[in-house]
Interface confidence: medium
């Protein structure tokens, strides 16, 4: 109970934190926190490489989809946004920025354009797109 | 610095929290936290009254839109969901569950159907709908 009181004072809360409630994060200021992952949607359109650089400059990466359960907030995302998925022409696989391979059944890949990068679209779809085309993008930071 | 160390241990963090990072909440477990407000999207379709009751049972209310800046994550919400906005036939105004009047220029109200309740749709649109029609809904809890 003491730690709850401490947290209340630390965060200028004057009420007890119910046991069913919890803090999320830590995340960069004004990012979305969900199941202890941090997300931010960026309105300005950049190509994939610029989007990746923007996320990296904020100590984050482009969106990585790793779990439909832990990331079910992504179901309801409107429009199309760069994520950290790229096509490796040599072996035909899709992999994330960290080098891990796209797990089966996580995303439905739809070939809308010519390209080696992927846009995230609602309901866990990946739309293939030319990496040099400007699009909005999603950065993600996984908390430790 | 001590409080950061304390928080690290409390949240099983083994790294320092950068000064630019912060915790969000508190929120009910597995809710979305953004700018210290808590949101949850519910998939099951209920009429407006059932949706309101569902939110209340979780110590929350149906979505209240009060600021485009503080709630800009709502821009990217796909589909249509009940929010806590109702039409008062006696004076023709739209008001929130807490009795406050809808501020001008916050929502674009679109008359899709005859009704006294409103669905939230992306980019700060409100669609008038019959309150007895089942729809998905958004609950919101404002932290103190």
């Amino acid at each position: 109970i003491w730690s709850a009181v401490f947290l209340n004072s630390l965060f200028n809360q004057e009420v007890q934190i119910p046991l069913t409630e919890s803090y999320c994060g830590p995340c960069p200021k004004n990012w979305i926190c969900y199941k202890n992952n941090c997300y931010q949607f960026f309105n300005e359109s950049k190509n994939w490489y610029e989007s990746q650089a923007s996320c990296m400059s904020q100590n984050a990466s482009l969106l990585k989809v790793y779990s439909k359960e832990d990331q079910d907030l992504l179901k309801l995302v409107k429009s199309y946004h760069w994520m950290g998925l790229v096509h490796i022409p040599t072996n035909g696989s899709w992999q994330w920025e960290d080098g891990s391979i796209l797990s089966p059944n996580l995303l439905t890949i739809i070939e809308m354009q010519k390209g080696d990068c992927a846009l995230y679209a609602s309901s866990f779809k990946g739309y293939i797109e030319n990496c040099s085309i400007p699009n909005t993008y999603i950065c993600m930071q996984r908390t430790v | 610095i001590w409080s950061a160390v304390f928080l690290n241990s409390l949240f099983n963090q083994e790294v320092q929290i950068p000064l630019t990072e912060s915790y969000c909440g508190p929120c009910p477990k597995n809710w979305i936290c953004y700018k210290n407000n808590c949101y949850q999207f519910f998939n099951e379709s209920k009429n407006w009254y059932e949706s309101q009751a569902s939110c209340m049972s979780q110590n929350a209310s149906l979505l209240k839109v009060y600021s485009k800046e503080d709630q800009d994550l709502l821009k990217l919400v796909k589909s249509y969901h009940w929010m806590g906005l109702v039409h008062i036939p006696t004076n023709g105004s739209w008001q929130w569950e807490d009795g406050s009047i809808l501020s001008p220029n916050l929502l674009t109200i679109i008359e899709m159907q005859k009704g006294d309740c409103a669905l939230y749709a992306s980019s700060f649109k409100g669609y008038i709908e019959n309150c007895s029609i089942p729809n998905t809904y958004i609950c919101m809890q404002r932290t103190v």
Epitope: I109, E111, Y127, E129 | -
Partner: antibody, heavy 123, light 107 residues
Framework: QVTLKESGPTLVKPTQTLTLTCTFS??????????VGWIRQPPGKALEWLAL???????RYSPSLESRLTITKDTSKNQVVLTMTNMDPVDTATYYC???????????????WGQGTMVTVSS | QSVLTQPPSVSVSPGQTASITCSGD??????VSWYQQKPGQSPVLVIY???KRPSGIPERFSGSNSGNTATLTISGTQTVDEADYYC??????????FGTGTKVTVL
């Protein structure tokens, strides 16, 4: 063999809501990658895409008409329904539904079209 | 919103080659489909993904796409090819976009 057929009113009054039904056969709208779209064509004019619904109930709308359109599906009945509110004489057109080609193959093409239904908006 | 521009009409003699162009910003970066529509009939897909022909479409129909222009070519044009032709592409802002349409007349 994939077939689609549109049905609905031939005459609608201005400000009314149009409801069109596309009944299809030869495929299932629960199969991954499948989609059904609506396209219209005013007399003597070009085709205009309106909306599309995917197998997983994900919906896409023409940005210029999004506020007026709703697309839904009934997988058990093999039907897709399009509603368009606040009809205006400029919405007079032939309305087609079409099958979107399968996953990762010609993702942007509509390979099979219905016969179309002519809708006139007039008072 | 994206705009795909086509010439309003193209005339060709039987047996000759008809070329229909479709212009749009960086169109070569996108996949283009082509549809044929005869009077009073529904559109029929004749080319998808720039160059591919659905089954049942004659070999005289071919497509190409680079730069800002996609082209539908009808080699050895026949009178049955007289129709309106529409190009179509997709992008993440306008989604599915159709061209302005070209009327092909076989003289």
């Amino acid at each position: 063999q994939v077939t689609l057929k549109e049905s609905g009113p031939t005459l609608v009054k201005p400000t009314q809501t149009l409801t069109l039904t596309c009944t299809f056969s030869g495929f299932s709208l629960s199969t991954s990658g499948v989609g059904v779209g609506w396209i219209r064509q005013p007399p003597g004019k070009a085709l205009e895409w309106l909306a599309l619904i995917y197998w997983d109930d994900d919906k896409r709308y023409s940005p210029s008409l999004e506020s007026r359109l709703t697309i839904t599906k009934d997988t058990s009945k093999n039907q897709v329904v399009l509603t368009m509110t606040n009809m205006d004489p400029v919405d007079t057109a032939t309305y087609y539904c079409a099958h979107r080609t399968g996953i990762a193959v010609a993702g942007i093409a509509f390979d099979i079209w219905g016969q179309g239904t002519m809708v006139t908006v007039s008072s | 919103q994206s705009v795909l521009t086509q010439p309003p009409s193209v005339s060709v003699s039987p047996g000759q080659t008809a070329s229909i162009t479709c212009s749009g910003d960086k169109l070569g970066d996108k996949y283009v489909s082509w549809y044929q529509q005869k009077p009073g009939q529904s559109p029929v897909l004749v080319i998808y993904q720039d160059t591919k022909r659905p089954s049942g479409i004659p070999e005289r129909f071919s497509g190409s796409n680079s730069g800002n222009t996609a082209t539908l070519t009808i080699s050895g044009t026949q009178t049955v090819d007289e129709a309106d032709y529409y190009c179509q592409a997709w992008d993440s802002s306008s989604l599915y976009v159709f061209g302005t349409g070209t009327k092909v007349t076989v003289l």
